[in-house]
């Protein structure tokens, strides 16, 4: 807390301007008037004030707005911004993109803070929505913006929003995140033609389901190892040897050097080695020739 | 033109005060901030502080606080810096610069004033 | 104490390309506009860089300024012998009010 003291003659600021940085805290408090920096808040970031003097002038901002700031204020709050804390900013009500943009501007090339984050919580709860503009916006700061969202909050984006997503966002997405952002994802591009649809869908392609795989390998698709590798296990082991042949095209090749990971692997252990044997590549632990293929899956329904 | 001019040399003795001078031409000496930066021999800058010529307002960077004293003459526009309690460490090329407004550059400098502070 | 670190040297053949970085913190370079002065052996330093990446008129193209998170980097290309001299990346600081670089010998070989 700064103490109340008597603003010094001729010190009474009459605007926000350079000529504070040379103000003592107790000084900044006392000549300051809070309704004139509510006002001029634009002008606070040009000006270099130290972080002992911001913490003033946001002291002064908590007692004139205690229910949290207006958005005439939190658009022009600069490098303030960075003082806030999570609690501060659950009080405030930020509707306008611009607004948004200015204070990720703030915190751009950091790690996202607390303080982004909540902000950003704050923003979405607010349109009741990720709609196009906000998700480009959020993932053009932070790209791993979308897959630090659970499921549950990713059912709330519209497919539309799904055009504003570019493959590097969705590089720390997990499966469960991409099972819900597919169906989104093949909705939005489904008027595409064949090689561009793939081009939009291949990097949602970690939630797509068994069916969708069989049907993408009859279009000649050339799907490289690296987005292969990515595939939900349970989609590609009941695809045959053909079909994984007509999926990858030449990429197949790389099928070698992956025989030890997940979902090569256990896709290989499903497959008569006769069938892997067309493909040339040596790969070995397939079900020897004479031995019955059991589907697991068909006996327990049946049972 | 913008031009800064500080005063010549000087040598002083270990526990002396030492005034450096810098006069302001090519533009209304109050509208720009005056800051001083020194260089000790085969060394970086170091800011030391900065006057409102306007107001005489100043704020000195921590090291120095309660050795040095900025002021300003608007008469004869010009700036001046005392250091006391000189000690060897204080030899340097002492610099004024002006500070622009707005982006906080330093725009134009002074040729510098060597002090030699020795026995 | 100096709170921008640069390289204490670098060095380059006529005609190649340079740079020189400065990394900060979030209370300096995180947050406030980065410029670069050149120091030729015995003058006064000489603005080169402002706001992040300006050039003051007469400062020729082959130097240029970027920044990213908490650093920045001086950018020097088609190296020429009269650019051999001291660099110096400068911002303010929020905690100090006002900083340097340790500086950066730049030596033009051959």
């Known amino acids: 807390e700064v103490e109340k003291t008597a603003c010094p003659s001729g010190k009474k600021a009459r605007e926000i301007d350079e000529s504070l940085i040379f103000y003592k805290k107790w000084e900044l408090e006392a000549c300051v008037d809070a309704a004139l920096l509510a006002t001029q808040m634009d002008r606070v970031n040009a000006i270099p004030f130290t972080y002992e003097q911001l913490d003033v002038l946001k002291h002064k901002l908590d007692e004139l707005y205690p229910q949290g700031y207006p958005e005439s204020v939190i658009q022009h709050l600069g490098y303030l911004f960075l003082k806030m804390s999570p609690e501060d900013i659950r009080k405030w009500n930020v509707t306008s993109l611009e607004t948004l943009k200015a204070l990720l501007e703030v915190n751009k090339g950091h790690e996202m803070s607390p303080q982004v984050a909540t902000l950003i919580d704050r923003f979405v709860k607010g349109r009741g929505q990720l709609d196009k503009d906000t998700l480009d916006t959020l993932t053009a700061f932070y790209p791993g913006y979308l897959c630090s969202l659970s499921p549950e909050e990713l059912s709330s984006v519209p497919p539309s929003s799904i055009w504003a997503v570019r493959p590097q966002d969705l590089d720390t997405c997990d499966p469960r995140q991409l099972d819900v952002l597919y169906p989104k994802a093949r909705l939005a591009f489904q008027n595409m033609n064949g090689s561009e649809y793939f081009v939009k869908i291949q990097s949602f392609l970690g939630g797509a389901p068994t069916e969708d795989l069989k049907a993408l390998s009859q279009q000649n698709v050339s799907m490289d190892l690296a987005t292969f590798m990515k595939l939900r296990t349970d989609a590609v082991l009941p695809l045959t040897v053909a079909e994984v042949q007509k999926l990858l095209g030449p990429h197949v090749e790389g099928l070698k050097a992956e025989e030890r990971h997940r979902p090569v692997r256990d896709w290989i252990l499903r497959q008569r080695q006769d069938d892997l044997d067309t493909l040339g590549l040596g790969l070995q632990g397939g079900i020897p020739n004479g031995y019955l293929v059991l589907d697991l899956s068909v006996q327990e329904a049946l049972s | 033109q913008v031009e800064l001019v500080q005063s010549g040399a000087e040598v002083k003795k270990p526990g002396a005060s030492v005034k450096v001078s810098c006069k302001a031409s090519g533009y209304t000496f109050t509208g720009n901030y005056i800051n001083w930066v020194r260089q000790a021999p085969g060394q970086g800058l170091e800011w030391m502080g900065i006057i409102n010529p306007h107001g005489g307002d100043t704020k000195y960077a921590q090291k120095f606080q309660g050795r040095v004293t900025m002021t300003r003459d608007t008469s004869i526009s010009t700036a001046y810096m005392e250091l006391s309690s000189l000690r060897s460490e204080d030899t340097a090329v002492y610099y004024c610069a002006r500070w622009h407004h707005g982006t906080w550059i330093f725009d134009y400098w002074g040729q510098g004033t060597l002090v030699t502070v020795s026995s | 104490d100096i709170v921008l670190t640069q390289p204490p040297s670098v060095s380059g053949a006529p005609g190649q390309r340079v740079t020189i970085s400065c990394s900060g913190s979030?209370?300096?370079?995180?947050?406030?506009?980065v410029s670069w002065y050149q120091q030729l052996p015995g003058t006064a330093p000489k603005l080169l860089i402002y706001n992040d990446n300006q050039r003051p008129s007469g400062v020729p193209d082959r130097f240029s300024g970027s920044k990213s998170g908490t650093s920045a980097s001086l950018a020097i290309t088609g190296l020429q012998s009269e650019d051999e001299a001291d660099y110096y990346c400068?911002?303010?600081?929020?905690?100090?009010?006002?900083?340097f670089g340790g500086g950066t010998k730049l030596t033009v070989l051959g």
């Open positions: 979030s209370s300096n370079i995180g947050s406030n506009y």
């Open positions: 400068s911002t303010y600081d929020r905690r100090t009010f006002s900083v």
